[in-house]
């Protein structure tokens, strides 16, 4: 099948980095400067992406692969293939319509992007707050309050078996 196809279509022999040049009797010609073809058998080469403005070049364009961009310091990538750059905020902030704003009390953001998230509610897991949360850091949950009562050992012994219907004293 491959041999048949190549007999029928001489362009299928053109490797990546070249194109099948109809103007030159379907000879495989190298991609011109600032263009590439990532697969064989292509009739045109694609224009290389240019990393301009807030974008900077992460990987140069070659004859067989497109350039890759990332964002200038103070910005981060958005979208597939870093199609956009969005400004960073400081830790403890989130990006709102009005720019970077501090996290509200009870929320935190430990990154330069994304939104402020609520502190962990330790009591939902029956634990106590060991280290308070800040705008930049979540709370640290510690042992349950009962485990911290005077005389309690660091290892909680198994609870004694109780008869059904009896409430704990």
């Amino acid at each position: 099948f491959e041999r048949t196809r190549s007999l029928q279509d001489p362009c299928s022999n053109c490797p990546a980095g070249t194109f099948c040049d109809n103007n030159r009797n379907q000879i495989c010609s190298p991609c011109p400067p600032n263009s590439f073809s990532s697969a064989g058998g292509q009739r045109t080469c694609d224009i290389c992406r240019q990393c301009k403005g807030v974008f900077r070049t992460r990987k140069e364009c070659s004859s067989t692969s497109n350039a890759e961009c990332d964002c200038t310091p103070g910005f981060h990538c958005l979208g597939a293939g870093c199609s956009m750059c969005e400004q960073d905020c400081k830790q403890g902030q989130e990006l709102t319509k009005k720019g970077c704003k501090d996290c509200c009390f009870g929320t935190f953001n430990d990154q330069k992007r994304g939104i402020c998230r609520p502190w962990t509610n330790c009591s939902l897991d029956g634990k106590s707050v060991l280290v308070n949360g800040t705008k930049e850091r979540d709370v640290v949950c510690g042992p349950s309050p009962a485990d911290l009562s005077p005389g309690a050992s660091s290892v909680t012994p198994p609870a004694p078996a109780r008869e059904p219907g009896h409430s704990p004293q």
Partner: nanobody
Framework: EVQLVESGGGLVQPGGSLRLSCGAS????????MLWFRQAPGEGLEWVAN????????YYVDSVEGRLTISRDNAKNALYLQMNSLRAEDTAIYYC????????????????WGQGTTVTVSS
């Protein structure tokens, strides 16, 4: 080719005014959020203001609120920044940038930038 070209910068005394313009070409200007950024000498890029597709939503960094006004004229493919009551700390290169095409919550993503125009506020 998608292009943004800023103009209107210059030297102005404190308390003075300037109007920056940004001409857009190569894309459907009215479909995109547009933004102004600035970069003061030795500093990083700072977002200044943005405006939605029809000009009904405008947002500003706190330090310029009430002094700078962003606007657009979709018929002329133009973005503007009216700068009043200028201060020394407004000295910077001002860039216009193309934002997102949708009406999503991310109003600060950009992909195309102009070359910038310099504003110097000094007596």
């Amino acid at each position: 080719e998608v292009q943004l070209v800023e103009s209107g910068g210059g030297l102005v005394q404190p308390g003075g005014s300037l109007r920056l313009s940004c001409g857009a070409s190569g894309f459907t200007f009215s479909s995109y959020w547009m933004l102004w950024f600035r970069q003061a000498p030795g500093e990083g890029l700072e977002w200044v203001a943005n405006i939605n597709q029809d000009g009904s939503e405008k947002y500003y960094v706190d330090s310029v609120e009430g002094r700078l006004t962003i606007s657009r004229d979709n018929a002329k493919n133009a973005l503007y920044l009216q700068m009043n009551s200028l201060r020394a700390e407004d000295t910077a290169i001002y860039y216009c940038a193309r934002g997102g095409e949708g009406y999503s919550d991310s109003h600060h993503g950009t992909d195309v930038w102009g070359q910038g125009t310099t504003v110097t506020v000094s007596s």
